[in-house]
C-alpha cells in the first residue's frame, strides 16, 4: 500500500515502500520479487533468453 500523503503513482507504475518511490511495473519482468510488483496488474514473463541465457 502506498505511503500516506504521497501522490498516487502514474499509470504503469506502483509504489515501492522499500525504495520509497514509484517504480515502473515494466521492471517486474526483470525483478518480479520487488515489493511494488504486488501493485502491478500482471508482470509479463521474461523472454526465455533473458532468464536462461
Amino acid at each position: 500500500e502506498q505511503a500516506p500523503g504521497t501522490a498516487p503513482c502514474s499509470r504503469g507504475s506502483s509504489w515501492s515502500a522499500d525504495l520509497d518511490k514509484c517504480m515502473d511495473c515494466a521492471s517486474c519482468r526483470a525483478r518480479p520479487h520487488s515489493d511494488f510488483c504486488q501493485g502491478c496488474a500482471a508482470a509479463p514473463p521474461a523472454p526465455f533468453r533473458l532468464l536462461w541465457p
Partner: antibody
C-alpha cells in the same frame, strides 16, 4: 549523490591482461544490477557483461564477444565492481564504463576509464 | 542479436523547434503491456545519461520537453522545444533479451 568511479585502465600489450575496478557510493549497491559498457569510435556503445544480485546467486551474463575472456564480479561489502580482462586485443580498446541499474536499464554511469591495447 | 538502427545519423534543429529521432529494432521488443526500449543522452566528454525507460517513462529529473513513444519495432524520441543544452548524441537501447544492444547514435546540433 550517486557516484561511480572506475580505475585500472591504461596501456596494455596485445595478449595481456587487465583488471578494472569501480567503486560505488550514493545508492544501495547491493540492490542494483551492475554492468560494464564499452565505447569505441568503431563499435559505439557495447554492453559487455552484467552481474545480478546475491538473491540471484550473483548470476552473470556476457556479450558473445567477451565470453570466456572477461569475468565480471562484485564485492557488495565494499560496493565494488570488477572486470577481469584476459587475452586482450586491439579491438578491446575503448572507454569502459561502470553502470548500475535497478533492472534492465542503466540508471547510473561512471565517468569511464580508458583502455588502450597496443604494442 | 537484436540490431537497433537509428535515424538520422545527425540533425540540426533551430532553438525552440522540435527534434525527432527514430530507432528501429530488427525484431519486436514489446509485450502487450510494455516496451523494453530506453533512450540515453551523451554530451561531449561525458558518460551517457538515462532519459527514458520502457519507451515512454521519463527518468527522474529529466525535463518534460523530452518524450518517448512507439512499440514493437519502431520507437521515437521527441525533444520540444529544443534548448541549447540538448546538443548531444542520443542512443536507444533495448532490454528485451541478453545481449542488450545500443543504436549507433544520433548527433543533435542546435542552431
Amino acid at each position: 549523490e550517486v557516484k561511480l568511479e572506475e580505475s585500472g585502465g591504461g596501456l596494455v600489450q596485445p595478449g595481456g591482461s587487465m583488471k578494472l575496478s569501480c567503486v560505488a557510493s550514493g545508492f544501495t549497491f547491493n540492490n542494483y544490477w551492475m554492468s560494464w559498457v564499452r565505447q569505441s569510435p568503431e563499435k559505439g556503445l557495447e554492453w559487455l557483461a552484467e552481474i545480478r544480485l546475491k538473491s540471484d546467486n550473483y548470476a552473470t551474463h556476457y556479450a558473445e564477444s567477451v565470453k570466456g575472456k572477461f569475468t565480471i564480479s562484485r564485492d557488495d561489502s565494499k560496493s565494488r565492481l570488477y572486470l577481469q580482462m584476459n587475452n586482450l586485443r586491439a579491438e578491446n580498446t575503448g572507454i569502459y564504463y561502470c553502470t548500475g541499474g535497478f533492472a534492465d536499464y542503466f540508471d547510473y554511469w561512471g565517468q569511464g576509464t580508458t583502455l588502450t591495447v597496443s604494442s | 542479436d537484436i540490431v537497433l538502427t537509428q535515424s538520422p545519423a545527425s540533425l540540426t534543429v533551430s532553438l525552440g523547434q522540435r527534434a525527432t529521432i527514430s530507432c528501429r529494432a530488427s525484431q519486436s521488443v514489446s509485450t502487450s503491456s510494455y516496451s523494453y526500449m530506453q533512450w540515453y543522452q551523451q554530451r561531449p566528454g561525458q558518460p551517457p545519461k538515462l532519459l527514458i525507460k520502457y519507451a515512454t517513462n521519463l527518468d527522474s529529473g529529466v525535463p518534460a520537453r523530452f518524450s518517448g513513444s512507439g512499440s514493437g519495432t519502431d520507437f521515437t524520441l521527441n525533444i520540444h522545444p529544443v534548448e541549447e543544452e540538448d546538443a548531444a548524441t542520443y542512443y536507444c537501447q533495448h532490454s528485451w533479451e541478453i545481449p542488450y544492444t545500443f543504436g549507433g547514435g544520433t548527433k543533435l546540433e542546435i542552431k
